[in-house]
């Protein structure tokens, strides 16, 4: 089941996944001046069997200016900034990530992809938090959040992390000194906004049907 809300936002912190559970979707997004090829994929999907997981489909971007080329256009200044992802790209990847059953690695970049990656996580996904540069982590518990299904609704647990404005950065798991954390984990106060049972995309007629605007008759 997809987790319809995003992981919680922690002031002065970012999150990332170390590996992606099977079923995770990654939108095919292109940077400015490029678009998805019309016959191409809408998203990549983490799929697999008992022994191996990988990203199915391939995202492809083509120049918006021409039909059948992937020629580079001069990037706008705001596009020249380092590519970011929803979970914050990081060069460090735990060595055991690839062997985690039922999970995919961070997918490799594709040509002319957008600066931000949009993932749709699934129930059971865990993300890890770290304070941004210039902030230090004060842990009251695990600096992680898990998407859980409770009473038919998906929700993310609340990470027990506070980032204070001191010039010292914390690291992702594996790079920080172990810290004592209280037993148990307080659950998020806000439950997921979306479920397939209590959520509807509303379809409705346009509320007003002004003849001059909305209707035209053949003479």
């Amino acid at each position: 089941e997809l987790c319809d809300d995003d992981p919680p936002e922690i002031p002065h912190a970012t999150f990332k996944a170390m590996a992606y559970k099977e079923g995770t979707m990654l939108n095919c997004e292109c940077k400015r001046g490029f678009r998805r090829i019309k016959s191409g994929s809408l998203y990549m999907l983490c799929t697999g069997n008992s022994s191996h997981s990988s990203w199915d489909n391939q995202c492809q971007c083509t120049s918006s200016a021409t039909r059948n080329t992937t020629k580079q256009v001069t990037p706008q200044p705001e596009e020249q900034k380092e590519r970011k992802t929803t979970e914050m790209q990081s060069p460090m990847q735990p060595v055991d990530q690839a062997s985690l059953p039922g999970h995919c690695r961070e997918p490799p970049p594709w040509e002319n992809e957008a600066t931000e990656r949009i993932y749709h996580f699934v129930v059971g996904q865990m993300v890890y938090y770290q304070c941004v540069q210039g902030y230090r982590a004060l842990h009251r518990g695990p600096a992680e959040s898990v998407c859980k299904m409770t009473h038919g609704k998906t929700r993310w647990t609340q990470p027990q992390l506070i980032c204070t404005g001191e010039m010292e950065t914390s690291q992702f798991p594996g790079e920080e000194k172990p810290q004592a954390s209280p037993e148990g984990r307080p659950e998020s106060e806000t439950s997921c906004l979306v479920t397939t049972t209590d959520f509807q995309i509303q379809t409705e007629m346009a509320a007003t049907m002004e003849t001059s605007i909305f209707t035209t008759e053949y003479q």
């Epitope: 319809d4 995003d6 079923g23 979707m25 799929t47 979306v194 959520f199 995309i201």
Partner: antibody
């Protein structure tokens, strides 16, 4: 017949701009027909060849709403129209809008 | 476009029966096959996506297949299962549907 019409589909409780939205037609007593989709994040659209040029799909992400529009209705457009979010499949559906075209 | 062919178009069964609906794609769609249930006057409801049963859908529903041939099985038909079932490929756009299978009470 001949009139224009726009129906709307409002999403709530999720990041509307980040999911494709599709439109499906169901004529009376018939099956489901996939009309087309739009990605509200950048307004990329894809149409089924059967509906290309017959309808226009658009979206306004600022109000989390997608639209299906006809410039000139025909009697054969009489049907139930559903919008749906594209997740693993079309995972969340609207309740549908009945469009009846008669002279 | 990929053409999806469902069979049978309708079937009559009794409560407790095992029911199997098949769907064939005109070309390989890997495991990108979805199943929907629709009851009269209601919107369709996704019950199976790729190889995953949707949360909240009873375990008597199961799906199988890969490539071009797929099946939806209801192990023990219940009164609430009488409906029309549609397969749909989500391998490539347009995401085409099968023509539907109506499951009626015998």
């Amino acid at each position: 017949p001949g009139e224009s019409l726009q129906i709307s589909c409002k999403g709530s409780g999720y990041k509307f701009a980040n999911y494709w939205i599709g439109w499906v037609r169901q004529m009376p007593g018939k099956g489901l027909e996939w009309m087309g989709i739009i990605y509200p994040g950048d307004s990329d659209t894809r149409y089924s060849p059967s509906f290309q040029g017959q309808v226009t799909i658009s979206a306004d992400k600022s109000i989390s709403t997608a639209y299906l529009q006809w410039s000139s209705l025909k009697a054969s457009d009489t049907a139930m129209y559903y919008c749906a979010r594209l997740g693993w499949g079309m995972d969340v559906w609207g309740q549908g809008t009945t469009v009846t075209v008669s002279s | 476009d990929i053409v999806m062919t469902q069979s049978p178009s309708s079937l009559s069964a009794s409560v407790g029966d095992r029911v199997t609906i098949t769907c064939r794609a005109s070309q390989s769609i890997s495991s990108y096959l979805n199943w929907y249930q629709q009851k009269p006057g209601k919107a369709p409801n996704l019950i199976y996506a790729a190889s995953s049963l949707r949360s909240g859908v009873p375990s008597r529903f199961s799906g199988s297949g890969s490539g071009t041939d797929f099946t939806l099985t209801i192990s023990s038909l219940q009164p609430e299962d009488f409906a029309t079932y549609y397969c749909q490929q989500s391998y490539s756009t347009p995401w085409t549907f099968g023509q539907g299978t109506k499951v009626e009470i015998k």
